[in-house]
């Protein structure tokens, strides 16, 4: 079938989903295509315990993640409702800086050095996580 | 010996449709996304299409957006290009081949022979 | 969509020769830039991927530098089998676009 039970090769597991991290940047809509064409999405941060292990593998280096406001409302690639959902800006962000002198605001959201995160246009070659979920059917116990 | 063989090719009148497969062997083709890549005679390599290995994300280029379906059947190991709406300028040699991601660094390493695609009245 | 260009389009070489490809983007691709072989009526063969990665299997004649905008490849000697065309393709964006080729021929 096509149930991924197992994380491919070079791919972390983590909580029943995999992560693959770039040491590569690229503009985030190319690294959410490239998630895609992996059969995956750029990170969703749903908890602290997350973002903790995320924040681990990265370490202080600006890195992509599935979040941006592109078409207005801040939305999560995979369809996580962002308002009720975690959150871990840096104070005073997002801010849609206009300052940058690259054209237009800040749209994608990324970790900072610190873990927090920040705004920033989506043009920047940044660092990226990849993430997919194990199958929900491979997760139940095995009948005995 | 990992292997790409394309077919379905062959002569087709202006607006009509063809499908060509691509049948993988001795990979797990499921692990892979696949892309297909023509070449007009005398003329370079073009991009055309792209999907995931599971199927679930597809890319095109805009010569043949909304006219050509990139697929895949992975119980039988294969990839399939519909093409629908055919113009001249799709005349082409078609070859298959598949993506590898090393480190985040996409290429295309195994590559079928083609199959030749004839758009013409 | 980014452009690719190559220089020259066609050159002639004697066997034995040093001979640069260049290949040029529209914008900078960092460092996701492929370079393929082809020989004619044959599919292309990954020469290059990563700007510089030798692929396996490849002749360390084989060699290829830069990054952002400007990319090189070059055969250190040239040899009989190394009379084909070669592509350049960027992999920093869909579409993939390729560079339009540059033909290798004997002098």
């Known amino acids: 079938g096509s149930e991924r039970t197992c994380c491919p090769v070079n791919w972390v597991e983590h909580e029943r989903s995999c992560y693959w991290f770039s040491r590569s940047g690229k503009a985030w809509a190319d690294a959410d295509n490239y998630c895609r064409l992996e059969d995956a999405h750029l990170v969703v941060v749903t908890s602290w315990e997350e973002q903790k292990f995320v924040q681990h593998h990265i370490g202080p280096v600006n890195t992509w993640m599935g979040l941006h406001d592109q078409n207005g409302p801040w939305k999560w690639v995979d369809g996580t409702d962002y308002e009720t959902g975690f959150k871990n800006w840096r104070p005073e962000q997002p801010d849609d800086w206009y300052g940058h002198g690259l054209g237009g605001g800040e749209d994608c959201a990324h970790f900072t050095d610190d873990g927090r995160w920040n705004d920033d246009v989506c043009q920047r070659p940044y660092r990226w996580v990849c993430e997919t979920e194990l199958d929900k059917a491979s997760q139940e116990p095995p009948l005995l | 010996e990992v292997q790409l063989l394309e077919s379905g090719g062959g002569l087709v009148q202006p607006g009509g449709s063809l499908r060509l497969s691509c049948a993988a062997s001795?990979?797990?083709?499921?692990?892979?996304?696949m892309s297909w890549v023509r070449q007009a005679p005398g003329k370079g390599l073009e991009w055309v299409s792209v999907?995931?290995?599971?199927?679930?994300?597809?890319f095109y280029a805009d010569s043949v957006k909304g006219r050509f379906t990139i697929s895949r059947d992975n119980s039988k190991n294969t990839l399939y290009l519909q093409m629908n709406s055919l113009r001249a300028e799709d005349t082409a040699v078609y070859y298959c081949a598949r993506r590898i991601a090393v480190a985040g660094n996409e290429a295309f390493d195994i590559w079928g022979q083609g199959t030749m695609v004839t758009v013409s009245s | 969509d980014i452009q690719m260009t190559q220089s020259p389009s066609s050159l002639s070489a004697s066997v034995g020769d040093r001979v640069n490809i260049t290949c040029r983007a529209s914008?900078?691709?960092?460092?996701?830039l492929i370079w393929y072989q082809q020989k004619p009526g044959k599919a292309p063969r990954l020469l290059i991927y990563a700007a510089s990665s030798l692929q396996s299997g490849v002749p360390s004649r084989f060699s290829a530098s830069g990054s952002g905008t400007d990319f090189t490849l070059t055969i250190s000697s040239l040899q009989p089998e190394d009379f084909a065309s070669y592509y350049c393709q960027q992999t920093n964006s869909i579409p993939f676009t390729f560079g339009p080729g540059t033909k290798v021929d004997i002098k």
């Open positions: 001795r990979f797990t083709f499921s692990s892979y996304a």
């Open positions: 999907i995931s290995g599971r199927g679930g994300s597809t």
């Open positions: 914008q900078s691709i960092i460092s996701y």
